[in-house]
Amino acid sequence: MKVLQEPTCVSDYMSISTCEWKMNGPTNCSTELRLLYQLVFLLSEAHTCVPENNGGAGCVCHLLMDDVVSADNYTLDLWAGQQLLWKGSFKPSEHVKPRAPGNLTVHTNVSDTLLLTWSNPYPPDNYLYNHLTYAVNIWSENDPADFRIYNVTYLEPSLRIAASTLKSGISYRARVRAWAQCYNTTWSEWSPSTKWHNSYREPF
């Protein structure tokens, strides 16, 4: 049993890091493998992650972490029974994928303006809370070409757009994702989309 693609990990910079790797053949990840991880810190304890299958030869493990900060560095050991298959390290702050924003809502009660709001996925005491910027994707269910991205570079998790910039009388969907420049993160996953009917009326 050998590792074909070494584990690569990303952190949500809050409580979970996800590691993925590929074996050289079909593997029952949860019964055959264990990923041990330990913070390189005084008094830290070793933890064991039981991986799940991710395709025939792929495995994924969700590592639970406390109080993630930029100085943290973890040792990773991938075991198959008594055999050490791979040894590495992981610094969460250097591989951040933010959590997806939630609670995306479209407020249509102001006739000529659409207000989109969503929730910041981090608590106020997390460093990313004040450092996320967002991209809002709006598209028409009727017209695949009617697809637009709005970059929200301010901290407030909201976006105002004129209803007149969208076609009237048709349904639209929106979703939002986040990233943080300070840690050079990847984009988060998209939030669940929300749907509304754009009933903007042109003034006579």
Partner: antibody, heavy 116, light 111 residues
């Protein structure tokens, strides 16, 4: 919000022991290390040691080895610092402070006076 | 236990800018991150800066931190009378043993 509530002031005789408590609330108690730091009157901050509330393991500054014991009670989310063989130079305010590499939150402090 | 060196006192007028230095021999500052704490008279220390230059939520951007080599600096702009306090730098060291040294402390007087 995070709160670290410390026990009240103590007056002790030289040679005695003191046990200071620090009750935590507003966060997951076992997810954050706790430090103890002291400050003698008019002096600076001095690190005494650290405890991992999850397993209870500890590490102490060399200066206090053999005299200090840090413990925790997860059922009450409380950490304790006991200092024995007290001498007059142990008169200080003793702080608990939550954090790992740095101290995010501090208790208000407990004044321990050692006097004959 | 190693100690980090700070100037005993600094002073400046309201609205001015002040800097407080923190230097450490050995490996402490050079290999680690620096934090800064503010201690107002009669109160517990409060975290101002961590990770050399990051501010916890609620700390105004008048406070800034930087690090170069084995020394670090705390900057305070737009000084206010309420900034009058003792300021301590802190870090951690892992050699020969783990420890958390603090600076000697700097008394800031707002004239």
């Amino acid at each position: 919000q995070v709160q670290l509530v410390q026990s009240g002031a103590e007056v002790k005789k030289p040679g005695a022991s003191v046990k200071v408590s620090c009750k935590a609330s507003g966060y997951a108690f076992t997810s954050y290390y706790m430090h103890w730091v002291r400050q003698a009157p008019g002096q600076g901050l001095e690190w005494m040691g650290i405890i991992n509330p999850r397993g209870g393991s500890t590490s102490y500054a060399q200066k206090f080895q053999g005299r200090v014991t840090m413990t925790r009670d997860t059922s009450t989310s409380t950490v304790y610092m006991e200092l024995s063989s007290l001498r007059s130079e142990d008169t200080a305010v003793y702080y608990c402070a939550r954090g790992k590499y740095w101290m995010y939150d501090w208790g208000k402090g407990t004044l321990v006076t050692v006097s004959s | 236990q190693s100690v980090l060196t700070q100037p005993p006192s600094v002073s400046a007028a309201p609205g001015q800018k002040v800097t407080i230095s923190c230097s450490g021999g050995g490996s402490s500052i050079g290999n680690s991150y620096v934090s800064w704490y503010q201690q107002l008279p009669g109160t517990a220390p409060k975290l101002l800066i961590y990770d050399n230059n990051k501010r916890p939520s609620g700390i105004p951007d008048r406070f800034s931190g930087s690090k170069s080599g084995t020394s670090a600096t705390l900057g305070i702009t737009g000084l206010q009378t309420g900034d009058e306090a003792d300021y301590y730098c802190g870090t951690w060291d892992t050699s020969p043993v783990w420890e958390w040294p603090f600076g000697t402390g700097t008394k800031l007087t707002v004239l």
